[in-house]
């Protein structure tokens, strides 16, 4: 896509581990869990432990210009790249995305995109060509997700914007579903 990196920094996502244990599969797939009726899926916190500081899923914040052919966004956009092992923080090396699984004999967890958002961008084109308007899909948040089978070290890669398409960022909605109503409330609940 011809991205130009502008700036980046990292944030560690530390799940609130004791509060929301991972729901059993039958609950996650429960037919009543549709987004419009129940305001979205339950929070995804897959670990049950007392030591919150032991787990880490990093959100790397990248500020970049978006390009489309010869055209470039008028302003940079900020997006996330998900990285980290979702294992004990003490086992995470300095080089993000490298290292060993924290619990190789047990279930594996991975830091992957959770939600995405769409952002309007205006693209400026050279030679006096008319500007373009596009909507770009950006990763909005990351989560630790249980992998269904063991992945060995050689398969590990950071999850960047092209690596996986996350689910859309459904915000919790009030029961009376309105047309962009209660926006401030929704922003606070995100």
């Amino acid at each position: 896509q011809g991205w130009q990196a502008f700036k980046n920094d990292a944030t560690e996502i530390i799940p609130e581990l004791g509060e929301y244990p991972e729901p059993p599969p039958e609950l996650e797939n429960n037919k009543t869990m549709n987004r419009a009726e129940n305001g979205g899926r339950p929070p995804h916190h897959p670990f049950e432990t007392k030591d919150v500081s032991e787990y880490s899923c990093r959100e790397l914040h990248f500020t970049r210009y978006v390009t489309d052919g010869q055209c470039r966004s008028a302003k940079p956009v900020t997006e996330l790249v998900c990285s980290g092992q979702c294992g004990p923080a003490r086992l995470l090396p300095n080089a993000i995305g490298r290292g060993k699984w924290w619990r190789p004999s047990g279930p594996d967890f991975r830091c992957i995109p959770d939600r995405y958002r769409a952002q309007r961008v205006q693209l400026l084109c050279p030679g006096g060509a008319a500007p373009r308007a596009r909507k770009v899909r950006l990763v909005a948040s990351c989560k630790c997700k249980r992998l269904t089978r063991f992945h060995n070290q050689s398969e590990l890669k950071d999850f960047g914007p092209e690596a996986a398409r996350p689910q859309k960022g459904r915000k919790p909605r009030p029961r009376a579903r309105g047309a962009k109503a209660n926006q401030a409330e929704l922003e606070n609940a995100y």
Partner: antibody, heavy 121, light 109 residues
């Protein structure tokens, strides 16, 4: 490739409700932004509502506000559009349509085959 | 709610050029309305020809192009073919709410 398969034709009485389903295959429903469009016989297309990924919420056309409910069952990758208090002018073909799965957000790229809803006493 | 206007009908000769337009009751149509153009043939679901003013899709024939023209969105068909006879709809984005135009019936003869 995204494919959308809608439920079969329905005949309803005025005042009743109808629930049309749209089954997604090729991708999961959470990866897509689903919209609903209807077309009365011999008339044009009319947007009813859909998911807005900018705000992360489902929004409805003012005309249908309070009468339409769009829901999704992620366990079966099926979207639903329920329209209540039906009247004869709601007789139309109802389409579901989704965006494309790619870097740029493009809506209405894939369409269901349409569901004819007839409202008649 | 905004009203989106299109020519009710247009006729073009085979091989000829025709431009369909799409106006907004709120004023000038801009790139920030992300204009879409759809083609619909009798008994079929619509299909997208153009997104975001001028962005063609893999299935869009090269003879179709989108632009802004005189404060309206425009769909230009250059070198019309008999199979282009259809109803054409534009769609404008008003901050996440969409409004279709009334459609243009294009006849190729």
């Amino acid at each position: 490739e995204v494919q959308l398969v809608q439920s079969g034709a329905e005949v309803k009485k005025p005042g009743a409700s109808v629930k049309v389903s749209c089954k997604v295959s090729g991708y999961t429903l959470t990866e897509l932004s689903m919209h609903w469009v209807r077309q009365a016989p011999g008339k044009g297309l009319e947007w009813m509502g859909g998911f807005d990924p900018e705000d992360g919420e489902t929004i409805y056309a003012q005309k249908f506000q309070g009468r339409v409910t769009m829901t999704e069952d992620t366990s079966t990758d099926t979207a639903y559009m329920e329209l209540s208090s039906l009247r004869s002018e709601d007789t139309a073909v109802y389409y579901c349509a989704t965006d494309t799965v790619g870097y740029w957000e493009k809506f209405f790229q894939h369409w269901g085959q349409g569901t004819l809803v007839t409202v008649s006493s | 709610q905004a009203v989106v206007t299109q020519e009710p009908s247009l006729t073009v000769s085979p091989g000829g050029t025709v431009t369909l337009t799409c106006g907004s009751s709120t004023g000038t149509v801009t790139i920030d309305h992300y204009p879409y153009w759809f083609q619909q043939k009798p008994g079929q679901a619509p299909r997208t020809l153009i997104s975001d003013t001028d962005d063609k899709h893999s299935w869009t024939p090269a003879r179709f192009s989108g632009s802004l023209l005189g404060g309206k969105a425009a769909l230009t068909l250059s070198g019309a073919q008999p199979e282009d006879e259809a109803e054409y709809y534009c769609l404008l984005d008003y901050g996440g709410r969409f409004v279709f135009g009334g459609g243009t019936k294009l006849t190729v003869l």
